[in-house]
C-alpha cells in the first residue's frame, strides 16, 4: 500500500532533495530557503534563485523550508517555573528548562512544569533525580511512600495502600485500641 501523502509532500517529492515544486508551475523546482530564512518569493524560473529573507526578531525557522512566514519564538512559562536556557535565534527556538535540583513533569507533549527533586528524608535515594524524572526514594522501616515522600506509618489508615508496608504498626494500633475498650 502506498502511504497517503498530503498535497505539499506530493509536490515536494517530485523535486530533488533541497528543492520544492513551484506552486504555479509544476515544471519548475525551486531551491528551498536555508534555516533562519523564509520564502519571500518563489524562483522565477529553472536555475534561478528563490527569494529568501531572514527571519525578523522574535521569529525563526529551524530547518530548510519554503514557509511564507517564520515561526514565532516560544516563551518560557514563568508560572510553570520554567527558565530560559538559551534565547531564540533566527534558526533556533527558545530552549526552556528548570533550575538546578528540579525536574520537568510533562502534563502534555508541549507543556511541562518544574518541581523540586525529592530529598528522600526518612529514606534513601534509589535513583537520582533526572532532567525529566523525580528522585526515586526507598523508605526506611516504619515509613511508607506517599506523593514521593517518606511518611511515618502512624499516618497510615486502614483504607490506604500503605497497610501492607505498615502492617506491624497497624496491628499495634489496632491492639492498643482494642485493649482500651471495656
Amino acid at each position: 500500500l502506498v502511504p497517503h501523502l498530503g498535497d505539499r509532500e506530493k509536490r515536494d517529492s517530485v523535486c530533488p532533495q533541497g528543492k520544492y515544486i513551484h506552486p504555479q508551475n509544476n515544471s519548475i523546482c525551486c531551491t528551498k530557503c536555508h534555516k533562519g530564512t523564509y520564502l519571500y518569493n518563489d524562483c522565477p524560473g529553472p536555475g534561478q534563485d528563490t527569494d529568501c529573507r531572514e527571519c525578523e526578531s522574535g521569529s525563526f525557522t529551524a530547518s530548510e523550508n519554503h514557509l511564507r512566514h517564520c515561526l514565532s519564538c516560544s516563551k518560557c512559562r514563568k508560572e510553570m517555573g520554567q527558565v530560559e536556557i538559551s534565547s531564540c535565534t533566527v534558526d533556533r527556538d527558545t530552549v526552556c528548562g528548570c533550575r538546578k535540583n528540579q525536574y520537568r513533569h510533562y502534563w502534555s507533549e508541549n507543556l511541562f512544569q518544574c518541581f523540586n527533586c525529592s530529598l528522600c528524608l526518612n529514606g534513601t535515594v534509589h535513583l537520582s533525580c533526572q532532567e525529566k524524572q523525580n528522585t526515586v526514594c526507598t523508605c526506611h522501616a516504619g515509613f511508607f511512600l506517599r506523593e514521593n515522600e517518606c511518611v511515618s506509618c502512624s499516618n497510615c489508615k486502614k483504607s490506604l495502600e500503605c497497610t501492607k508496608l505498615c502492617l506491624p504498626q497497624i496491628e499495634n494500633v489496632k491492639g492498643t485500641e482494642d485493649s482500651g475498650t471495656t
Epitope: K75, R77, K78, E79, M80, H105, W107, Q113, F115, N134, E147, N148
Partner: nanobody
Framework: EVQLLESGGGLIQPGGSLRLSCAAS????????MVWVRQAPGKGLEWVSH????????YYADSVKGRFTISRDNSKNTLYLQMNSLRAEDTAVYYC????????????RGQGTLVTVSS
Amino acid sequence: EVQLLESGGGLIQPGGSLRLSCAASGFTFAHETMVWVRQAPGKGLEWVSHIDRVGQDPYYADSVKGRFTISRDNSKNTLYLQMNSLRAEDTAVYYCALLPKRGPWFDYRGQGTLVTVSS
C-alpha cells in the same frame, strides 16, 4: 479550607457552546495560577488550559486551541471556560484546580461538572 465549585455543564449538541464557571474560596484567588483539566469516560486527566494570576498569555491544549477561552475575574474569585464549536470528543467531566506546587498531582481540585456533547 480551599473550595472550588464548578458549574455550567450539561448536554449540548455538536457545534454548540457552553460557559463553565468555577467559584473559588478559602485562599487568595488573585495570587494563584488556575487550571482547567478534564477526564473523558475511561481516560486519564487531560490538561485543557491554564491562566496566570493576571490573566496574561493563557495556555491551551492543541485539542481546544481556537475553540476554548479561559478567563478569570479576580474581583469575583471566579474562573471561566468559554467552550465554542463543541465536538463529541470534548465530552468529559471538567474540573477546575489550583496549579500544583509540591508535585505533579492536584492537591486542590473541584468536584467537576459533566459536559456531554451529543446529537
